[in-house]
């Protein structure tokens, strides 16, 4: 009998054991068996929910997500002269999401190849590490934007630079905290050789030892700690926030203000259904499954949520849209392949029409550069 | 219900040779990794050999003991389970049980009544 | 291979009473260890799985303990039907291996 180290390992669901016995595949050939998994992890790793519904997704994340946020921070970094500490946040946010999207790729060809991953252990642990840490600093950024957005209602104070270092220094310190609860996904080995399938997987089989209590109490923790404290956060702001507006005077401006409110409030809670609840809530039943019963019968819900969970980066432009008069200006601009100075340019002549003809039937919409807060 | 009825046991000399079939019916048998297992008589029981399904390429995995002497195979057509045994010792006489690997590969969840193969001069 | 060790051969007991049938397994095996049942005359039926999981239409006086290498089936009021072998079964790695089984006796 081939001995090998004796460690069974599960992954996301999957179950795998070292395997100590000889295996002939089906041409006679006898091969050293290291990792074998079960025929429900077979019939996941080389079904069409893995190998055709996730890439599918992944790629349309990508190719939403890396244009939108490319552009949003580039509006927040050099397109926006006042740094609010909104501006601030959603800049943080757009970073994470694309942080998160450049490594889609490489996510992408393992899923299409079969789950096989050939592009080393290193690379494997920074997708992952990145993937987990996109939706954590995505649900933290979202917080911090949504009470700014809050007290912004109720203090409505002029920009002050203190503010902004504040903004700068929670963002600093999300980044800092994310980092240091995502070490544990750096840290474990995330690949593993099935010889069985001749396959490399990245994520989806992991040691049973360090599966069956350790990934419960770390996502629980995660799932207490940095998804309902912030979401209890940002669900106390808007209602605050919809009670303010709803009890405020109602002129043009303030009804146009509230409407945009409305708009980021519903954005901000498809994210949290769609991306963040599902995810983090089977992240935590589908661990307590593996750690009470040994498997998971929540495994394909997981997995879509999981992938549902990358829609965020592709969600969060819209809240920029609602947010930032800048990034609204400039994202209107770009889906109407117009530059900006050129619909300055057309601004100033049909203003300088307007005022010699003492016309106001027509009136273009402000691209100065201009951020609400 | 699952259900697992094995044939094919009898009297062997040793050197010669038996092949014992297994009819399973009552689950999708294509999906299931399925066993043999052996208890010889007042022994306990000994894991034989193992055939993967099809999307592991019906991988098969033997003991020691029966290494390069016993084949395991499937028709999935047919839900049947086979046992090609050659070159048979003493040693091997023992109640032959045919077993399905739960599908999370998690222990054997069910047995069938079993066969006996008895090798005797 | 995992050797799964049950040190006692034989156990005897009364209609009603509880009974403990002990397995230690020669390196750890988390929780992957099942208990089947083995009724004289008969096939082996899974019982437990997973250390503490009973199977489908298993009687609730039935319950498993255990992980790492300690492991213990529990038989509450027991029945005279009880009368059987009871092997364990480590499933951490492969071969999957058993203990050498606990013949229960009813007084």
């Known amino acids: 009998t081939i001995q090998g180290t004796n460690r069974s390992s599960k992954g996301r669901s999957l179950i795998g054991k070292v395997d100590g016995t000889s295996h002939v595949t089906g041409k006679g050939v006898t091969v050293e068996t290291v990792f074998s998994v079960d025929e429900f992890s077979a019939s996941v790793l080389t079904g069409k929910l893995t190998t055709v519904f996730l890439p599918i997704v992944y790629t349309i994340v990508f190719v939403v997500g890396l244009p939108s946020n490319g552009m949003a921070l580039w509006v927040f970094l050099f397109r926006t002269k006042k740094k609010h500490p909104a501006v601030i946040y959603m800049a943080n946010l757009a970073l994470a999401d694309l942080l998160s999207v450049i490594w889609f790729p490489l996510k992408i060809a393992y899923h299409i190849h079969g789950n096989n991953w050939i592009y080393g252990e290193a690379l494997c642990n920074v997708l992952i590490g990145f993937f987990y840490g996109n939706m954590y600093c995505s649900i933290l950024f979202m917080t911090c934007l949504s009470v700014q957005r809050y007290w912004v209602i109720v203090n409505p104070m002029g920009h002050s630079r203190k503010k902004a270092n504040i903004a700068i220094g929670i963002s600093l310190a999300i980044w800092l905290l994310i980092l240091l609860v995502t070490i544990p996904l750096y840290v474990v080995k995330q690949t593993i050789f099935i010889p069985a399938l001749n396959i490399t997987t990245c994520h989806d089989v992991l040691p049973e030892q360090l599966l069956v209590g350790d990934m419960f109490n770390y996502f629980l923790s995660l799932a207490i700690g940095v998804f309902l404290f912030p979401a209890f956060l940002t669900a106390s702001a808007y209602v605050l926030m919809i009670r303010m507006l709803r009890s405020s005077a109602m002129d043009e401006n303030s009804e146009k203000k509230r409407k945009r409110a409305i708009k980021l409030i519903v954005t901000v809670l498809a994210m949290y259904l769609i991306c963040f609840t599902p995810s983090n809530l089977l992240l935590v039943v589908h661990y307590f499954l593996i750690k009470s019963q040994g498997q998971s019968h929540v495994y394909a819900l997981y997995i879509v949520a999981l992938c549902l969970s990358t829609l965020n980066s592709c969600i969060d432009p819209f809240v920029y849209y609602f947010v930032s008069h800048d990034f609204r200006d400039h994202a209107k601009n770009a889906l109407l392949c117009r530059s900006v100075r050129t619909v300055k340019q057309m601004q100033v002549s049909l203003t300088s029409k307007k005022h010699s003809r003492k016309s106001s039937s027509y009136s273009s919409s402000s691209t100065t550069v201009k951020t609400s807060y | 219900e699952v259900q697992l009825v094995e044939s094919g046991g009898g009297l062997v000399q040793p050197k010669g040779s038996l092949k014992l079939s297994c009819a399973a019916s009552?689950?999708?048998?294509?999906?299931?990794?399925m066993h043999w297992v052996r208890q010889a008589p007042g022994r306990g029981l000994e894991w034989v050999a193992r055939i993967r399904s099809k999307n592991v390429h019906y991988a098969t995995y033997y003991a020691d003991s029966v290494k390069d002497r016993f084949t395991i195979s499937r028709d999935d057509s047919q839900n049947m389970l086979y046992l090609q045994m050659n070159n048979l010792k003493t040693e091997d006489t023992a109640m032959y049980y045919c077993v399905r690997e739960d599908y999370y590969g998690s222990s054997y969840d069910y047995w069938g009544q079993g066969t006996t193969l008895t090798v005797s001069s | 291979d995992i050797v799964m060790t049950q040190s006692h051969k034989f156990m005897s007991t009364s209609v009603g009473d509880r009974v403990s049938i002990t397995c230690k397994a020669s390196?750890?095996?988390?929780?992957?260890v099942a208990w089947h049942q083995q009724k004289p005359g008969q096939s082996p039926k899974l019982l437990i799985y997973w250390a503490s999981n009973r199977h489908t239409g298993v009687p609730d006086r039935f319950t498993g303990s255990g992980s790492g290498t300690d492991f213990t089936l529990t038989i509450s009021n027991v029945q005279s039907e009880d009368l059987a072998d009871y092997f364990c079964q480590q499933y951490s790695s492969y071969p999957f291996t058993f203990g050498s089984g606990t013949k229960l006796e009813i007084k």
């Open positions: 390196q750890d095996v988390r929780s992957a």
């Open positions: 009552g689950f999708t048998f294509y999906s299931y990794a």
